[in-house]
């Protein structure tokens, strides 16, 4: 831990003669800085310099060439890299008085004459004398006000609302301050602050606009923090609206945005009492140019059941706003001719959702569908294939005789999407075929029986079973099935000998 810096002269306070020069030396184990009473604009005659010495300590000297009443105040030497904002500035202090027979009180800024008191709290009326020996009294409209006085701070007490004047006498000459106005502020537990950014995504060259509004509060200080702040890129404006109620609208405008302007834009509003602070922030992103991202919620091969209602949802991220269109087999989708509709909805600032809706899916709805999103800077597309799934159905079941050989072929033609599988079953005891247990599946490896399957097109299949010899009447069943359903048909095969007998009869 660093020990506190030390100051030379080693005194709590020092009285310096008017117009004389004085210097304060600060020694520390790390880099040290000075905090002193005047603002930077007023401190032209204050010089701060670092000094080398052989002690191994860091030395910073504060020099005043010509002391005036304005130099009266507290000088603090502190380690500049170790302070945090919530703690009191920790360092070594010396209070300097510069008595001036013509200036009894230390000059103040206009805001110092507004003393805001919160909920009967104590307050300080900051009339500080340039000479510690000067007697001071405090007056209001009713006369002298009893309050404790400290020449380093002023009058401390609980004050009612109204004007107060500090009075001092120096060498028989009477001095009065201008009135200090004590103003009572009802403490509010929260500041009503609202932030609005109509856009949070921009591209290079556009103008960023962010607003913060404070409601029902006139005594507010609002600060902006944003990426371009250091370069002073932003233009701030304040508009005061009084009807129907008080509203302060602060606007930050950053013209000609670049990618470097991306980041958090924060407004911090603080009541004049500094007791209540509220912050709001928004993250702004600036892109070199516009962009489009397409994120489908389905795959590149999709299936829909016949007559089904199905939605295909695509998420699109884009800036500037995109134009979104749908194609089918590379042709623009003409919605009024089909039971297909598309729509686009804006979900968030740069997020869109487009839906392709099939109302009652038909076989002809199968095909390649493409979503195209485009803006002035980008074009993106996504294509998927849609198959309408149709339950299996048998179109035809016929037999074909091979003449005298006694062989017979049965052909079963079926359709469906996906393409149906065809299975064959036989029933050898024709009288018992009503009983399901009499049917057996025809295996591929049975001798004298050949089964084969041919695809006729994308949705039609033909199965064939060839019996080398049919010696007795049998029943043959064709079973066509796919994911959506199954259908079967049966056919009787009569042995050629029986057929000729029948023919004679």
């Amino acid at each position: 831990q660093l020990s506190l810096p030390s100051i030379l002269p080693n005194e709590n306070e020092k009285v310096v003669q008017l117009n004389s020069s004085f210097s304060l030396r600060c020694f520390g184990e790390s880099e040290v800085s000075w905090q002193y009473p005047m603002s930077e604009e007023e401190s032209s005659d204050v010089e701060i310099r670092n000094e080398e010495n052989n002690s191994g300590l860091f030395v910073t000297v504060l020099e005043v060439s010509s002391a005036s009443a304005a130099h009266t105040g507290l000088y603090t030497c502190y380690y500049n890299h170790t302070q945090t904002e919530e703690n009191e500035l920790e360092g070594r202090h010396i209070y300097i008085y510069v008595p001036d027979p013509d200036v009894a009180f230390v000059p103040l800024g206009m805001t110092d004459y507004l003393v805001i008191v919160e909920d009967d709290d104590s307050a300080i009326i900051p009339c500080r004398t340039t000479d510690p020996e000067t007697p001071v009294t405090l007056h209001n409209s009713e006369g002298v006000v009893p309050a404790s006085y400290d020449s380093r701070q002023g009058f401390n007490g609980t004050f009612t609302v109204g004007p107060y004047i500090c009075e001092a006498t120096v060498k028989g000459k009477k001095f009065q301050t201008i009135p200090f106005n004590v103003y009572a502020l009802k403490a509010t537990s929260e500041l009503d602050l609202e932030m609005e950014a109509l856009k949070t995504v921009y591209k290079s060259g556009e103008t960023i606009v962010v607003t913060c509004a404070v409601f029902n509060n006139e005594v507010v200080d609002l600060q902006w923090t944003y990426p371009g702040e250091v370069k002073g890129k932003g233009i701030t404006m304040l508009e005061e609206i009084k009807v129907p109620s008080i509203k302060l609208v602060y606007t930050l405008t950053v013209p000609e945005a670049t990618v470097k302007d991306s980041g958090d834009y924060e407004c911090a509003a603080r009541q004049a009492t500094r007791e209540v602070k509220e912050m709001k922030k928004v993250t702004i992103s600036v892109h070199e140019k516009g962009f489009i991202e397409i994120k489908p919620t389905f795959s590149q091969l999709e299936a829909v059941n016949l007559h089904e209602v199905k939605h295909f949802v695509v998420e699109v991220r884009a800036y500037p706003p995109p134009r979104i269109s749908w194609l089918k087999n590379n042709l623009t989708l003409i919605e009024n001719l089909t039971e297909i509709t598309t729509d686009v909805e804006k979900i968030q600032e740069i997020r869109y959702r487009s839906k392709l809706k099939l109302i009652r899916a038909k076989e002809e709805d199968s095909g390649h569908y493409t979503i195209v999103a485009q803006n002035e800077d980008a074009v993106k597309s996504y294509t998927f294939e849609l198959l309408t799934q149709v339950p299996s159905s048998i179109l035809d079941l016929v037999d074909d005789h091979h003449g005298s050989t006694g062989g017979q072929t049965v052909r079963c033609t079926a359709e469906g999407t996906p393409l149906p599988d065809i299975e064959w079953m036989i029933c050898k005891d024709i009288k018992k075929c009503n009983n399901e247990t009499s049917w057996t599946i025809l295996a591929n490896n049975v001798s004298n029986i050949i089964t084969e399957i041919h695809s006729r097109d994308r949705s039609t299949v033909e199965g064939r079973v060839t019996f080398a010899k049919v010696e007795e009447t049998i029943a043959v069943r064709c079973l066509a099935k796919n994911l959506l359903g199954a259908e079967n048909r049966e056919l009787k095969l009569v042995a050629p000998t029986l057929r000729s007998e029948l023919t004679v009869a």
Partner: antibody, heavy 118, light 107 residues
Amino acid sequence: QVQLVESGGGVVQPGRSLRLSCAASGFTFSSYGMHWVRQAPGKGLEWVAVIWYDRSNKYYADSVKGRFTISRDNSKNTLYLQMNSLRAEDTAVYYCAGGRSRGAFDFWGQGTLVTVSS
Amino acid sequence: DIQMTQSPSSVSASVGDRVTITCRASQDISSWLAWYQQKAGKAPKLLIYAASSLQSGVPSRFSGSGSGTDFTLTISSLQPEDFATYYCQRTNSFPRTFGQGTKVEIK
């Protein structure tokens, strides 16, 4: 030596309020920003709120904003946390803490347990 | 808000081992980082502040390094009393986010 002692914890129903106190001694309380940090059972540390040394500023974690209020009385060397609209997820040991070591918390209280349960 | 991510979430080690815990900030925090040790049922204890400065009274086997977004806590030779949970914390601005913690257990 530096001492921070929290009090005011206990069992409270959801939606109700509780006020925690932290009594400080052994250091110049009025020069330090003070913080509340909490730790849910079996979980990590979560920073809750801070109040500046001179009460000029307060910050809160998003999880408690609008429900908790941090305050202090420098004349009594005491830090407070007013907790309103309590929720089950506010159940935790609450510590007060402060310090000067470049924003780190040199000193901590022993903690007080707040249980929010119906 | 800046996120602090610690790794690993737990580590098993033996007395005498060298243990390294890392902490990553989602944005540059310069050297505004602290490390704490916490034992069951106790308040956390400050070990390291300003990324590498050892808090007074803390044994020299603890050291910290790093700047910007990547930080490390090293225990050069693990002692029986070092079995605890360790947290990193950003110490500039608000919220003063903590890492999720790293538990150092006996192997």
